[in-house]
C-alpha cells in the first residue's frame, strides 16, 4: 500500500482541533510583488518580511517596499515600514542579518540617480529600531559582517573601492581602490584581489591577492598572477596563472597566505574551472573540470594540509563555472555526501559516499519501489536523487535534498528508481540511517521541512493549482495525517521554518488571487499541541550509525571511530524541544585500509580497498612542491584520511623527504612578498 495508508498507522488524536487552535493567518494589506523573509537571531522568534513591488510608470519604474516584523515565529506581523521612512529597499541586496545572535540588520535603500552615495538602514536590536545612514559610496555588494565581530562591515562600491566600517556602518572608510573580490577570513582578516590596469575582467589572471589584518591600516601582497581565490575551512586557495601559457593551478595556504604550496591537482585551461565543493578544518573536496564542454570533471579529496590530493570520483556532474552540481553534504550523518555522475551514455546517476569520499556507491533501491523504465533489469536498479541540476533543468522538483544535523540519520529527497535519473514526475524518498536504506515517503513532488529535530516532518504537495492542505508525520515519514489549514485555497509559494529545525512552527506562504486583487498571505501553524508532552528517556533508543553488519566487531567504524546515538523512537509522539542536544557516544576503532586514502600517484580500483599505482606514474619518483622546496615522497600508496581517529591495526609506511632543491610555482615565494602600511 502507499506510504501512510496501511493499518499500522496510528492517528494522532484530535489533531484537527489542536492545529486549528494553533493556526494563525496573516493577510498582508499591501500587494503582491516579491517577498523575502529573514530570521533575525536564533530562538528569538523574530522574522523580518520585506515586500517590494515595481510600479510601471511611463518613463521609469517606481518602487515601493513594506517591511513587516514578527516576534512570535510568524503568527502575527506588524507593519514597521515607517521605521525605514517608507523607503524603497533594494531586494538584490536582501536583508543583511548579522552573525549569531547579534540582532543586527542592514537594509540597503534605493536612492535617486544623482545622489553622492547610497543609503542604509541599520538596526542592532533585532529590528525594533532603525537608524538611517547615508553612505559615501554606492554599494555594489551586500554589506558583509566579520564572523568574529559584527560591528565590522565591509562592502565593495560600484567604483570598485573596498570600504570598511568599524562601528556597524555608522562611519565608512575606503581602504583600497581597484578591488575585484573581498572576503573576511578568520580573526577579522580581509583578503581581496586588486587589478592594476584596466578592470577586474581585463586583469583576470593578473590580479594581486592582498591581505589586511588590521582593517586597512597595513597590507601585505600575498599573491600575484591571481585568477581567483576562495576560503574553505582553514584553507586559503588561489588559482594562479602559469608563466608560459594560459593554464592555471591551485595553490593552497594554511597560514593566511604567508606561505603557499602548489596543490597536487591538474592544471586547468581558460575554459575550465576549479570548485571547492566542501571544506572543513580537516580536508577539502575539490572539483576539477574536464577540458572541453563536457559538463563533468573529477572530485579530488585533500590531505590535512590541502596539498596532496586523491582522485575520489570520476565523471562528476558539474555543468559550467557557477553552474549546477548535485554535490550535497548530508549533515545528518558524519562522512556522508551525495552527488551525481554523468555516465558514458549521458544518463545521470546518483552516487553516495559514507566515508568522506573514500568510496562511492549507488544508492540502494527502496524496498517499497519498482524499477522504472530506465532500468535494464527490472529487479536490479538503484535510487537516483534529484538535486540542483534537476531543478535547473526545470524538472518537476520543487526542493533539493534535505538533512539537518540535529535530526540524526534523516535525509529527504526527490528521486526516481531505475538505472539513472528519470525525467518523469518524481516521488519523495526518506532515509532514516543517513542514506544506507531508503523508503518511498510521498507520492509525487512535495515541499518538505523538518521540525522539532525530526519529531515532525511537514510536507505540502507541489501543484500548479491553489492548495489548502498540509501533511505531517510524527514517525519519520512512515504515516501521514492531512490538515486543511484554510477554507479558501491559496497559490503556494513557499514553506518557512526557523533554520536549525528546532522550531515547532511552520509558515505556509502564498497569495490569494481574485480578478481584482492579489495579496500575500501566510499561515503559521504551531505543532506544540500535537506533541503534547516532553520526551523522556523511555522515548529514545540506542542506534549505531553506519551499521551494516551487526556481527562484525568493526561494524559502524567510519573514519576511525563509531558513534552510538540516542534517537527518538518512531512510535513516540513527544517534543524533543528547543534545547534538544544530540546525544552520542563515540568509540575508537582499529585502523584498516578503509582508514586510508590512496596517496599521491595511487588510486583505488572500483570495489577494492587496496591502492594501486597510477599507470602513468609507475617507476617515476614521486616528487612535489611544498613551501617552495621539492619533496620526495616514499609511500606504499596510503595516507590517513583527514579527521580519521583510528588507532592500532594496519599501519602503512609513509615518509616525506626534503630534497633540499628549490622549486617555484610561479607564485610569490615568501621572501619576495611585500608589505605596506596606509
Amino acid at each position: 500500500s502507499a506510504p501512510g495508508e496501511d493499518e499500522e498507522c496510528g492517528r494522532v488524536r484530535d489533531f484537527v482541533a489542536k492545529l486549528a487552535n494553533n493556526t494563525h493567518q496573516h493577510v498582508f494589506d499591501d500587494l503582491r510583488g516579491s517577498v523575502s523573509l529573514s530570521w533575525v537571531g536564533d530562538s528569538t522568534g523574530v522574522i523580518l518580511v520585506l515586500t517590494t513591488f515595481h510600479v510601471p510608470l511611463v518613463i521609469m519604474t517606481f518602487g515601493q517596499s513594506k517591511l513587516y516584523r514578527s516576534e512570535d515565529y510568524g503568527k502575527n506581523f506588524k507593519d514597521i515600514t515607517d521605521l525605514i521612512n517608507n523607503t524603497f529597499i533594494r531586494t538584490e541586496f536582501g536583508m543583511a542579518i548579522g552573525p549569531e545572535n547579534s540582532g543586527k540588520v542592514v537594509l540597503t535603500a534605493e536612492v535617486s540617480g544623482g545622489s553622492r552615495g547610497g543609503r542604509i538602514f541599520r538596526s542592532s536590536d533585532f529590528a525594533k529600531n532603525f537608524v538611517q545612514t547615508d553612505l559615501p559610496f554606492h554599494p555594489l555588494t551586500q554589506m558583509m559582517y566579520s564572523p568574529q565581530n559584527s560591528d565590522y562591515l565591509l562592502a565593495l562600491s560600484t567604483e570598485n573601492g573596498l570600504w570598511v566600517s568599524k562601528n556597524f556602518g555608522g562611519k565608512w572608510e575606503e581602504i583600497h581602490k581597484a578591488v575585484c573580490l573581498a572576503k573576511w577570513g578568520s580573526d577579522n582578516t580581509i583578503f581581496f584581489t586588486t587589478y592594476a590596469n584596466g578592470s577586474c575582467k581585463a586583469d583576470l589572471g593578473a590580479l594581486e591577492l592582498w591581505r589586511t589584518s588590521d582593517l586597512g591600516k597595513s597590507f601585505k601582497t600575498i599573491g600575484v598572477k591571481i585568477y581567483s581565490f576562495g576560503l574553505g575551512g582553514r584553507f586559503l586557495f588561489a588559482s594562479v596563472m602559469a608563466d608560459k601559457d594560459t593554464t592555471r593551478r591551485i595553490h593552497v595556504s594554511t597560514d593566511q597566505g604567508d606561505t603557499w604550496s602548489m596543490a597536487q591537482l591538474p592544471s586547468v585551461g581558460q575554459e575550465q574551472f576549479y570548485s571547492i565543493l566542501a571544506a572543513n578544518d580537516d580536508m577539502v573536496f575539490m572539483h576539477v573540470d574536464e577540458p572541453g564542454d563536457t559538463g563533468f570533471g573529477t572530485i579530488f579529496t585533500s590531505d590535512d594540509r590541502g596539498i596532496v590530493y586523491s582522485k575520489s570520483l570520476d565523471r562528476h556532474l558539474y555543468t559550467t563555472t557557477g553552474g549546477e552540481t548535485d554535490f550535497t553534504n548530508v549533515t545528518s550523518l558524519r562522512g556522508v555526501y551525495i552527488t551525481s555522475v554523468l555516465s558514458e551514455d549521458n544518463s545521470i546517476q546518483t552516487m553516495i559516499t559514507f566515508d568522506q569520499g573514500g568510496r562511492w556507491t549507488h544508492l540502494r533501491k527502496p524496498e517499497n519501489s519498482e524499477c522504472d523504465a530506465t532500468a535494464k533489469n527490472k529487479n536490479e536498479c538503484s535510487l537516483h536523487i534529484h538535486a540542483s541540476y534537476s531543478i535547473s533543468q526545470k524538472l518537476n522538483v520543487p526542493m533539493a535534498p534535505l538533512s539537518e544535523p540535529n535530526a540524526v540519520g534523516i535525509v529527504i529527497a526527490h528521486g526516481s528508481v531505475g538505472d539513472a535519473i528519470s525525467v518523469m514526475v518524481p516521488d519523495v524518498y526518506i532515509s532514516d540511517d543517513g542514506g544506507y536504506s531508503w523508503t518511498k515517503m510521498l507520492e509525487g513532488p512535495h515541499y518538505y521541512t523538518i521540525l522539532d529535530s525530526g519529531g515532525i516532518i511537514v510536507a505540502i504537495e507541489h501543484s500548479s493549482r491553489p492548495i489548502n492542505v498540509i501533511k505531517f508525520s510524527t514517525d519519520e515519514g512512515q504515516c501521514w495525517q492531512t490538515y486543511t489549514f484554510t477554507r479558501d485555497p491559496i497559490y503556494f509559494t513557499g514553506l518557512a521554518s526557523e533554520p536549525g529545525a528546532r522550531s515547532m512552527n511552520i509558515s505556509i506562504w502564498g497569495f490569494t488571487e481574485s480578478f481584482l486583487t492579489s495579496q500575500w498571505v501566510s499561515y503559521t501553524i504551531d505543532f506544540k499541541d500535537i506533541l503534547e508532552r516532553n520526551c523522556e528517556e523511555k522515548d529514545y533508543t540506542i542506534w549505531l550509525a553506519h551499521s551494516t553488519d551487526p556481527e562484525d566487531y568493526e561494524d559502524g567504524c567510519i573514519l576511525g571511530y563509531k558513534e552510538q546515538f540516542l534517537r527518538l523512537r518512531k512510535s513516540s509522539v513527544c517534543q524533543n524541544g528547543r534545547d534538544y542536544v544530540v546525544t552520542k557516544q563515540p568509540s575508537i576503532c582499529l585502523c584498516s585500509l578503509e582508514d586510508f586514502l590512496c596517496d599521491f600517484g595511487y588510486y583505488r580500483p572500483e570495489n577494492d580497498s587496496k591502492c594501486v599505482e597510477q599507470p602513468e606514474l609507475k617507476g617515476h619518483d614521486l616528487e612535489f612542491c611544498l613551501y617552495g622546496r621539492e619533496e620526495h615522497l616514499t609511500t606504499n600508496g596510503y595516507r590517513k584520511i583527514p579527521g580519521d581517529k583510528c588507532q592500532g591495526g594496519v599501519n602503512p609506511v609513509r615518509e616525506v623527504k626534503d630534497l633540499k632543491k628549490k622549486c617555484t610555482s610561479n607564485f610569490l615565494s615568501p621572501e619576495k612578498q611585500n608589505s605596506k602600511s596606509n
Epitope: L31, F53, S518
Partner: antibody
Framework: QVQLVQSGAEVKKPGSSVKVSCKAS????????ISWVRQAPGQGLEWMGG????????WYAQKFQGRVTITADESTSTAYMELSSLRSEDTAVYYC?????????????????WGQGTTVTVSS | DIQMTQSPSTLSASVGDRVTITCRAS??????LAWYQQKPGKAPKLLIY???SLESGVPSRFSGSGSGTEFTLTISSLQPDDFATYYC????????FGGGTKVEIK
C-alpha cells in the same frame, strides 16, 4: 500608448453565439486584467467578467455564469468574449477595457483604456 | 454581489455650478471605487480611481472623496464639456457599476 481595438458589429439570431475580439497594442498585455462590460440601449454599464492574460484564469459575474466564456491569446495580445444562447435582451454595445488590479505590479485601479465598442444585435 | 446605489439619477445644472454626485455601497469597499464619464455613442472614460486619485489628463475640477460605503464625485465648476452621464464602479470583489447619473443643462 496602449490601445484596444475590437472586432466589428454583429447581427445574430436568438439561440446562437457571438465571439467578440479585443486586440491590445502598445503595452504589456499580460500584466493587466481585461474586463468585458456591456451597455444595452439606453441602459447603464454592466460588468460581465474578465481575464488576466498572464494568469490564464477568467472570472465571471454571476448573471452571466455558464453563458459567457472569456479567453486570451498572449501570442497575439488578443482577448475574446463569447456569449452563447443569445436572446433579444443581449442586444447591446460590448466593450473591452484594460482593468488595473490591486497587486504589487500594477498602479491603475480603474478601467483606464477602453475599446471602441462592438454592437451586437440579436434579432430573428 | 455588492450593490452600488447612485443618486441622483438625473441632475440639472448650469455652467459654473458646483455639482455633487453620491454613490453608496451595500457594504464597505474601503477605497476601491472609480468614477467614469460617458458621452452618447462613446466608451466610458476613467476620471477618478481609488476613490480620490485623479487619472492623468483629467481636469482638476473633478475630485473624489469618501471611503467605506459613502463616496462623492464633485465637479467644482461645471463646464460645457462636462454634460454627460457619470458612473461609479466598485472594485472590491467582482466589479459592479452604479446606475448612473445624467448631468444635463438646466
Amino acid at each position: 500608448q496602449v490601445q484596444l481595438v475590437q472586432s466589428g458589429a454583429e447581427v445574430k439570431k436568438p439561440g446562437s453565439s457571438v465571439k467578440v475580439s479585443c486586440k491590445a497594442s502598445g503595452g504589456t498585455f499580460r500584466s493587466y486584467a481585461i474586463s468585458w462590460v456591456r451597455q444595452a440601449p439606453g441602459q447603464g454599464l454592466e460588468w460581465m467578467g474578465g481575464i488576466i492574460p498572464g494568469f490564464g484564469t477568467a472570472w465571471y459575474a454571476q448573471k452571466f455564469q455558464g453563458r459567457v466564456t472569456i479567453t486570451a491569446d498572449e501570442s497575439t495580445s488578443t482577448a475574446y468574449m463569447e456569449l452563447s444562447s443569445l436572446r433579444s435582451e443581449d442586444t447591446a454595445v460590448y466593450y473591452c477595457a484594460r482593468q488595473g488590479r490591486k497587486t504589487g505590479y500594477y498602479y491603475y485601479y480603474g478601467m483606464d483604456v477602453w475599446g471602441q465598442g462592438t454592437t451586437v444585435t440579436v434579432s430573428s | 454581489d455588492i450593490q452600488m446605489t447612485q443618486s441622483p439619477s438625473t441632475l440639472s445644472a448650469s455652467v459654473g455650478d458646483r455639482v455633487t454626485i453620491t454613490c453608496r455601497a451595500s457594504q464597505s469597499i474601503s477605497s476601491w471605487l472609480a468614477w467614469y464619464q460617458q458621452k452618447p455613442g462613446k466608451a466610458p472614460k476613467l476620471l477618478i480611481y481609488k476613490a480620490s486619485s485623479l487619472e492623468s489628463g483629467v481636469p482638476s475640477r473633478f475630485s473624489g472623496s469618501g471611503s467605506g460605503t459613502e463616496f462623492t464625485l464633485t465637479i467644482s465648476s461645471l463646464q460645457p464639456d462636462d454634460f454627460a452621464t457619470y458612473y461609479c464602479q466598485q472594485a472590491d470583489g467582482h466589479i459592479t457599476f452604479g446606475g448612473g447619473t445624467k448631468v444635463e443643462i438646466k
